[in-house]
Amino acid sequence: ESSNQASLSCDRNGICKGSSGSLNSIPSGLTEAVKSLDLSNNRITYISNSDLQRCVNLQALVLTSNGINTIEEDSFSSLGSLEHLDLSYNYLSNLSSSWFKPLSSLTFLNLLGNPYKTLGETSLFSHLTKLQILRVGNMDTFTKIQRKDFAGLTFLEELEIDASDLQSYEPKSLKSIQNVSHLILHMKQHILLLEIFVDVTSSVECLELRDTDLDTFHFSELSTGETNSLIKKFTFRNVKITDESLFQVMKLLNQISGLLELEFDDCTLNGVGNFRASDNDRVIDPGKVETLTIRRLHIPRFYLFYDLSTLYSLTERVKRITVENSKVFLVPCLLSQHLKSLEYLDLSENLMVEEYLKNSACEDAWPSLQTLILRQNHLASLEKTGETLLTLKNLTNIDISKNSFHSMPETCQWPEKMKYLNLSSTRIHSVTGCIPKTLEILDVSNNNLNLFSLNLPQLKELYISRNKLMTLPDASLLPMLLVLKISRNAITTFSKEQLDSFHTLKTLEAGGNNFICSCEFLSFTQEQQALAKVLIDWPANYLCDSPSHVRGQQVQDVRLSVSECHRT
């Protein structure tokens, strides 16, 4: 017991932490002072009626990853204030409704990863009227969803069901929940997908399918009996798909009349881009989908891809596309031309070079595009990049950060409406007239700049942290500046006069520099009460670098002696 007790530390607010120890039972002596109790990653196997009896003010109880196989019936009887209960990844093979009955305040319940076959004989959650987040199921033994399982639940913010090995689904089991903001469904096989889909289409706003093999998925007409689908977003995460089954998935998505957003994360496409519909399949209507997000798409036979043209017509209404970290080196010109409504395109962490980008940004490509993100691609020339994008007449925001440009030419051409340019982490060591004068926001942080002397008459925000600047930029060159972030440079001082010369400045972040704490600098920074409103990282990030005897101290706290300040 005493070693158990020693493994637990509580602060004055009643937050008690005892995770990742060698506890084999809940420590004794817990009182009403305990508000939060984290005993995750221990070796607790048994919870008795008396363990938590006095914890009447307990709001959070985390018991994940122990070896709990038994919870006595009345173990939680005094936990009427409990809001958060995590029993995930234990050895609970039978769930009892008596555990949850007293938990009238519960908003979060996690029962994932316990070896139960079903959610019990009676409705477990019917008394949990305040429940917002519920996680149930496991990877292997949870095989059956019953009609009574979710009875009594009317609204959930998030429902996660690990039904990886689901073999039986009683119709209408999920229909009883009137509204679920986000349903996450883990299913290895797709056999019961359509049955579940029918039940959730009118109650779920965001549907997320995880870990499913859809290679052989075939859509058959649904008998929904109603067409008012609530689903606004459908996410496929770690899902396997083929050319043919993608077409089948699109037919399923056709059933969702109000679908606005489609997302594929960590998916595998086992295909070569052969999306031609067979003759008896009617043309797919993309409906109202405005946002398409693809992250880390794996295409094993990527270099065999040959014809995406059957998909082009589906893209005309899409407004936002993200294809991130998916080895994209070319967007076909014809596809770009079909993306007539596209306003936002994010191709971060891909393989684009200027010469292939030119093919993508061909004449009439992306006519509505306002934001283009090409962060961390293979761009190497600012001049070529700017020139390549001249076809994009409405482009205002460009992020080409994390490309290695190294140098910057004296002049460049850019789309004429440009307002935002991100050149952070591009290894540039100087800024020149290549930067367009129309900019309102410029980010050149994390580079090798030791000088910034550009006249940017419309610039409102300058992000130039993590460079090698020794002084603030000349305010007269930036007459409209509102925000200046210049932390972690080599600035040793700045004066009242310098700050006052930025007439419009509202926010300055200049911490993390090597300040020489002269009497003048200390006097100015310590006496200006208004300074704290402008310096958003004051006082914590403003440390003296010299004189040596005050090095590391906060500027606001340093006091120099009279003799130091009145030397003749």
């Epitope: 070079v353 961390q376 293979h378």
Partner: antibody
Framework: QVQLVQSGSELKKPGASVKLSCKAS????????INWVRQAPGQGLEWIGW????????NFNENFKDRATITVDTSASTAYMELSSLRSEDTAVYFC???????????WGQGTTVTVSS | DIVLTQSPATLSLSPGERATLSCRAS??????????MQWYQQKPGQPPKLLIF???NVESGVPDRFSGSGSGTDFTLKISRVEAEDVGMYFC?????????FGGGTKVEIK
Amino acid sequence: QVQLVQSGSELKKPGASVKLSCKASGFTFTTYGINWVRQAPGQGLEWIGWIYPRDGSTNFNENFKDRATITVDTSASTAYMELSSLRSEDTAVYFCARLTGGTFLDYWGQGTTVTVSS
Amino acid sequence: DIVLTQSPATLSLSPGERATLSCRASESVEYYGTSLMQWYQQKPGQPPKLLIFGASNVESGVPDRFSGSGSGTDFTLKISRVEAEDVGMYFCQQSRKLPWTFGGGTKVEIK
């Protein structure tokens, strides 16, 4: 500047394995692919395979699929290529090269000579 | 596999002459309007050096006397005025289909 520095020459007996290294500098290692190409004496170039350090994904020429393994140590910005069950026909200079734009090899290592002889 | 056939096997030129090297692919290397064909130069004892990518894009730092053209299956590398330093082997390479393949090479020598 971009550099790929390869390990030194190797003399191996038939049936043995060889593991070659390629240390990258001057660029963000995880952003680019690394390819391996070989050139037998007086012959042309033969593509072996690639790896993308960011996710560890690989692709191989079928001729090498069973014998070649390509790995990376991202913390050391180094790629490795191991070739097993060596035979005399594997005597060649082995090059690593940076893959840019998904399609072309813009920087090459100096090459490692592997001689397989009994 | 896509087979790349280069011709001629050897090209012997005087300084200042124009060199035309050819590479023919057994099938198209087009990819949505871009030809995925590269040209490399290799001097004895050195690794190959990229000259041209995407059939016609000259790699940065490569002298402008080098140019590439072609589409589909037929590609050409031209050296407008050959110089002594241009001697070596020239290889074409396709990255349209796996496995990536190289041509057998053309040897350029100065008379």
